[in-house]
């Protein structure tokens, strides 16, 4: 059941990214580190880079509430079991600052792409009986 909930959370993050993509014009047009083509075993490290990025509402009024709520939900911390898996490869993964910086639209697209990759890997690892997902 925990595995199922984990998948639901990951898919939910994709939906949150999709919702934020509707409001790119209401986001601060700041360039943010946006991992792409993330090497194997560095997915969780890249994920944390996306979570740490200072994505912000431009406070233009109309959509400010849903944007702020969505951004905060994107930063929901995964459980320590995944943190432990990240830890194993942390020293060999690129730092957040080393990734190319992109405006919010591309940042969100790359975040979605990473989430899709992580979901695919998670499903593959379950199919092949691997624990390290």
């Amino acid at each position: 059941q925990g595995q199922d909930r984990h998948m639901i959370r990951m898919r939910q993050l994709i939906d949150i990214v999709d919702q934020l993509k509707n409001y790119v014009n209401d986001l601060v047009p700041e360039f943010l580190p946006a991992p792409e083509d993330v090497e194997t075993n560095c997915e969780w490290s890249a994920f944390s880079c996306f979570q740490k990025a200072q994505l912000k509402s431009a406070n233009t009024g109309n959509n400010e509430r849903i944007i702020n709520v969505s951004i905060k939900k994107l930063k929901r911390k995964p459980p320590s079991t995944n943190a432990g898996r990240r830890q194993k490869h942390r020293l060999t993964c690129p730092s957040c600052d080393s990734y190319e910086k992109k405006p919010p639209k591309e940042f969100l697209e790359r975040f979605k792409s990473l989430l899709q990759k992580m979901i695919h890997q998670h499903l593959s690892s379950r199919t092949h009986g691997s624990e390290d997902s």
Partner: antibody
Framework: QVQLVESGGGVVQPGRSLRLSCAAS????????MHWVRQAPGKGLEWVAF????????YYADSVKGRFTISRDNSKNTLYLQMNSLRAEDTAVYYC???????????????????WGQGTTVTVSS | EIVLTQSPGTLSLSPGERATLSCRAS???????LAWYQQKPGQAPRLLIY???SRASGIPDRFSGSGSGTDFTLTISRLEPEDFAVYYC???????FGQGTKVEIK
């Protein structure tokens, strides 16, 4: 069982204050965001305010901003709504509702208000 | 801010008939962010559907939700006497409600 019980409603004059309470039981209160929603007589539902599970963020409808304050005491499993400068148009049944998206990664994941109280009536009249 | 417009305002049907309720958003809504509620007279609302199409706990399978983008639908396949009520759609995150659709007995 999971339950929310509102109290504190009543008849109050315009310009006066009132504090509503919502007692939660049957679930880990500190893991859920909480809402206040109201319904004027014969009207539809109007969202009023939301507070994050840990109280770190609060959001308000424009109609109550600057007059109403949402707060919570996780040690008492209680949600509050402090209503100041009350107006006739604040007359309504006030419901507290649990946000269905738990702060726990493996917890509930509903993007909706999944548990509601029975409501408490606030009448603002001179 | 997003506006949710529900139609029709009132739906007059007989038990056993199919009810189709519409909710139109003024801007695109991610399907995860769309919920439906049922409210009977003198009662608190009840969550029926979350994520546009997922039934909440304990909701019978005659209730179904669908749609994406700006157009969403709640369908009650065969109306039971207890289904006559007011139905509201809501966008999560802004927590805006539609004005409601009343399903009444014809």
């Amino acid at each position: 069982q999971v339950q929310l019980v509102e109290s504190g409603g009543g008849v109050v004059q315009p310009g006066r204050s009132l504090r509503l309470s919502c007692a939660a039981s049957g679930f880990t209160f500190s893991s859920y965001g909480m809402h206040w929603v109201r319904q004027a007589p014969g009207k539809g539902l109007e969202w009023v305010a939301f507070i994050w599970y840990d109280g770190s963020d609060k959001y308000y409808a424009d109609s109550v901003k600057g007059r109403f304050t949402i707060s919570r005491d996780n040690s008492k499993n209680t949600l509050y709504l402090q209503m100041n400068s009350l107006r006739a148009e604040d007359t309504a049944v006030y419901y507290c509702a649990r946000d269905g998206d738990s702060s726990d990664w493996y917890g509930d994941y509903y993007f909706g208000m999944d548990v509601w109280g029975q409501g408490t009536t606030v009448t603002v009249s001179s | 801010e997003i506006v949710l417009t529900q139609s029709p305002g009132t739906l007059s049907l007989s038990p056993g008939e199919r009810a189709t309720l519409s909710c139109r958003a003024s801007q695109s809504v991610s399907s995860s962010y769309l919920a439906w509620y049922q409210q009977k007279p003198g009662q608190a609302p009840r969550l029926l559907i979350y994520g546009a199409s997922s039934r909440a706990s304990g909701i019978p399978d005659r209730f179904s939700g669908s749609g994406s983008g700006t157009d969403f639908t709640l369908t009650i396949s065969r109306l039971e006497p207890e289904d006559f009520a007011v139905y509201y759609c809501q966008q999560y995150g802004s927590w805006t409600f539609g004005q409601g659709t009343k399903v009444e007995i014809k």
